[in-house]
């Protein structure tokens, strides 16, 4: 039979009163023992067989000093069995034996679940010798219990290489109901049901939930732990905890905030970080995400012109990071550009429209009616060309570029001229003789060079060579123009 | 299945007690609250106070206490609804019902009919 | 305690005629069930939590709304739907019911 030895009577539900054969009393004073006498209670032996040692792990000697006679079996007397206590109160349990004078160095240890207690525990082994026998009281005590210290304590003692093993301790520490899972907060979609989860444990067992939603609570019953809510789903956010109730009391929750998912807030800060002719480069700063993560985002871009059809192009990027280069715009325009993102309920209204506009573009088209003579007696070569129609958004002619390539003999050699905007013809000095020279000419803006031409080939003779026959950009749809000797 | 059955309907006299019985089975009678719920000839429902089957403790609406009292008798899966000292404006339908989270009221009794009377 | 009204009264339809009740809380409250009665018999729970069909109940009722306000539909009213509606809260004690609608055949 197990002695238990209770802190206090349970009230309904769990018990109606003391269990049969318990202890209702202090723990301190039922388990401690005098240390000043070897006075040993009768609580100490075995209820079953009162007055006789408990003869559960003996170790036999087999005869006495003398040599003549043999000796009882050694064992612990038996204990209380069951100790149930509250969390913080001090507790102090022990093991006794009586050991016969034959034999020496007797430590005993204590042991709690299979392992040894080692170090800063406190014990205290106490001797009380007789003509015969030395009665051992080993007494354990723990300060201000905690949960962990629920558990079974036995003793050890060795003897002659046998050891001796007392009945368990079992230490019950109870306390208020401990959560080992608490709701989380948590985004979900309005009116669709979710799962919420509690779960606390004792001792005392057992423990009961009650859930409780925006400081109401939901269920007007307890139930047992573990507990799942199923949230038949929200309209707006609401704060849900739960309460873990035993014998010691209540227990509550962190209280988790759960909230709606909705579409994100337009963008803020739209910013032009760089235009180009035909890019702009935006950035903005993006919205609250309405508790669901940003899927994607949208530019959208308004061509700002009295004269445009007023259609509205759409690029699609993603969320991160928050820039896009926007391309294929027309030079020297201007834009209106908003943004909008969404996320898994929706788009986003869109962020206040910005304006940008795009810088001059270089020229789309080339000179035209390139032609080239050699001028021999100065060792020039002459090119002449017609500017070429360009439009508005190219902006201001600001002059040419002459590209000129020389090849002799497996020798090429580009050489580069600029010409200011007035001139419709160049003069280069001739570099090789007997070579080839290839001329191309492109206008020049403030946004860039434009097109090249189509190349005009003259051929240089050596010294002596007289030909004055121009080279010229042929019509469209011809060969390679070549130089007609 | 799920099924509340009330006992049949009484006729009183003023100043007598009633005491309508709610038989619960198909499920855990202990993890239920039991609500009583009134009907006045021709009235809506008014809601008269639960009680709490695990514990056995009852809560009462407002114009419901003194004379009413709700109780339980476990073993047998059966709560109770007894109204001393009746007046003629006691007559009505007297209903229990299952009471699931959010206060819902998921299974219902027949009904009572108690009709107080000189 | 939380007074529920629920308006009209009566409303007076024809069957298929589309039915909207109203029911109103003079706070708000979190969930808002809805029971179907006829004469003679026990209420039978018609929606959940404000918009959740009890079991057995058909997709012709709906149910809708949040904080004072909350809605009852029947799409297309079938004969066996004429009868009394009650709306019931869930936020605080005491648990009130609404006064009652009653749907009638036109």
């Known amino acids: 039979a197990i002695t238990e030895a209770r802190e206090e009577a349970k009230p309904y539900p769990l018990f109606p009163g003391p269990l049969p054969g318990s202890l209702q009393t202090d723990h301190t004073s039922l388990l401690s023992l005098p240390h000043t006498s070897g006075y040993q209670p009768a609580l100490m032996f075995s209820p079953t067989q009162p007055g006789r040692p408990y003869t559960g792990n003996v170790a036999i000697p087999r005869v006495t000093s003398a040599g003549s006679k043999l000796l009882p079996p050694l064992a612990f007397k038996h204990t209380v069995g069951h100790i149930i206590l509250s969390e913080h109160k001090d507790v102090k349990f022990n093991c006794s034996i009586s050991v016969p004078n034959i034999y020496q160095d007797t430590t005993i240890s204590w042991w709690k679940d299979g392992k040894e207690l080692l170090g800063a525990h406190h014990a205290i082994t106490q001797f009380y010798p007789d003509d015969e026998v030395t009665a051992i009281i080993a007494s354990f005590s723990i300060t201000s219990v905690q949960r962990s210290d629920n558990g079974s304590y036995i003793c050890k003692m060795k003897i002659n290489n046998e050891e001796i093993v007392s009945d368990p301790i079992y230490i019950e520490v109870q306390g208020l109901p401990h959560f080992t899972k608490q709701p989380e907060s948590m985004n979900v979609t309005r009116n669709t049901a979710f799962n919420l989860t509690c779960q606390a444990v004792g001792p005392p067992e057992p423990v009961n939930i009650f859930w409780v939603q925006n400081s109401s609570r939901v269920n007007e019953q307890p139930e047992k732990s573990p507990s799942v809510l199923t949230v038949p789903g929200l309209t707006e956010m609401a704060v849900f905890s739960c309460e873990a109730h035993n014998d010691k009391g209540l227990t509550v929750s962190k209280g988790v905030q759960i909230n709606i998912k909705a579409i994100p807030s337009p963008p803020t800060e739209v910013s032009i970080h760089n235009s180009t002719a035909h890019s702009i480069l935006i950035s903005w700063v993006p919205g609250f995400d309405g508790y669901s993560p940003f899927r994607n985002c949208s530019v959208q871009v308004k061509e700002v012109d009295p004269l445009s059809n007023g259609s509205v192009m759409i690029f699609n990027t993603s969320a991160s990071p928050h820039m896009y280069q926007i391309k294929q715009l027309q030079a020297l325009a201007n834009y209106s550009i908003g943004v909008s993102c969404m996320n898994e309920i929706g788009w986003s209204a869109v962020s206040p429209w910005i304006l940008a506009s795009t810088t001059e573009g270089a020229p789309s088209v080339a000179p035209l009616n390139v032609t080239v003579f050699l001028n021999e007696s100065r060792d020039n070569v002459d090119i002449r060309w017609m500017k070429p129609l360009t439009k508005r958004q190219a902006g201001e002619l600001v002059g040419y570029r002459i590209s000129h390539v020389w090849q002799s003999a497996g020798i090429s050699k580009e050489l580069l001229e600029e010409v200011g905007q007035n001139n419709s013809r160049a003069q280069i000095s001739v570099q090789v003789h007997n070579a080839t020279c290839t001329v191309r000419i492109a206008a020049v803006t403030k946004g860039g060079v434009g097109p090249f031409s189509d190349p005009v080939k003259i051929f240089i003779p050596a010294h002596g060579w007289v030909d004055h026959a121009p080279s010229s950009t042929p019509a469209p749809g011809n060969a390679d123009p070549v130089l007609i000797i | 299945q799920v099924q509340l059955v009330q006992s049949g309907s009484e006729l009183k006299k003023p100043g007598a007690s009633v005491k309508v019985s709610c038989k619960a089975s198909g499920y855990t009678f202990a993890n239920y609250g039991v609500h009583w719920v009134r009907q006045a000839p021709g009235q809506g429902l008014e809601w008269m106070g639960w009680?709490?089957?695990?514990?056995?403790?009852?809560t009462y609406a407002q114009g419901f206490t003194g004379r009413f009292v709700f109780s339980l008798d476990t073993s047998v899966s059966t709560a109770y609804l007894q109204i001393s000292s009746l007046k003629a404006e006691d007559t009505a339908v007297y209903y229990c019902?299952?009471?699931?989270?959010?206060?819902?009221?998921?299974?219902w009794g027949q009904g009572t009919l108690v009709t107080v009377s000189s | 305690e939380i007074v529920l009204t629920q308006s009209p009264a009566t409303l007076s339809l024809s069957p298929g005629e589309r039915a909207t009740l109203s029911c109103r809380a003079s706070?708000?409250?979190?969930?808002m069930h809805w029971y179907q009665q006829k004469p003679g018999q026990a209420p039978r729970p018609l929606i959940y939590?404000?918009?959740n069909l009890a079991s057995g109940i058909p997709a012709r009722f709906s149910g809708s709304g949040s904080g004072t306000s909350y809605t009852l539909t029947i799409s297309s009213p079938e004969p066996e739907d004429f009868a009394v509606y009650y709306c019931q809260q869930w936020s605080s004690n005491p648990r009130t019911f609404g006064g009652g609608t009653k749907v009638e055949i036109k």
């Open positions: 706070s708000s409250v979190g969930y």
């Open positions: 939590a404000t918009s």
């Open positions: 009680i709490n089957t695990y514990q056995g403790e009852p």
């Open positions: 019902a299952r009471g699931v989270r959010y206060a819902y009221m998921d299974y």
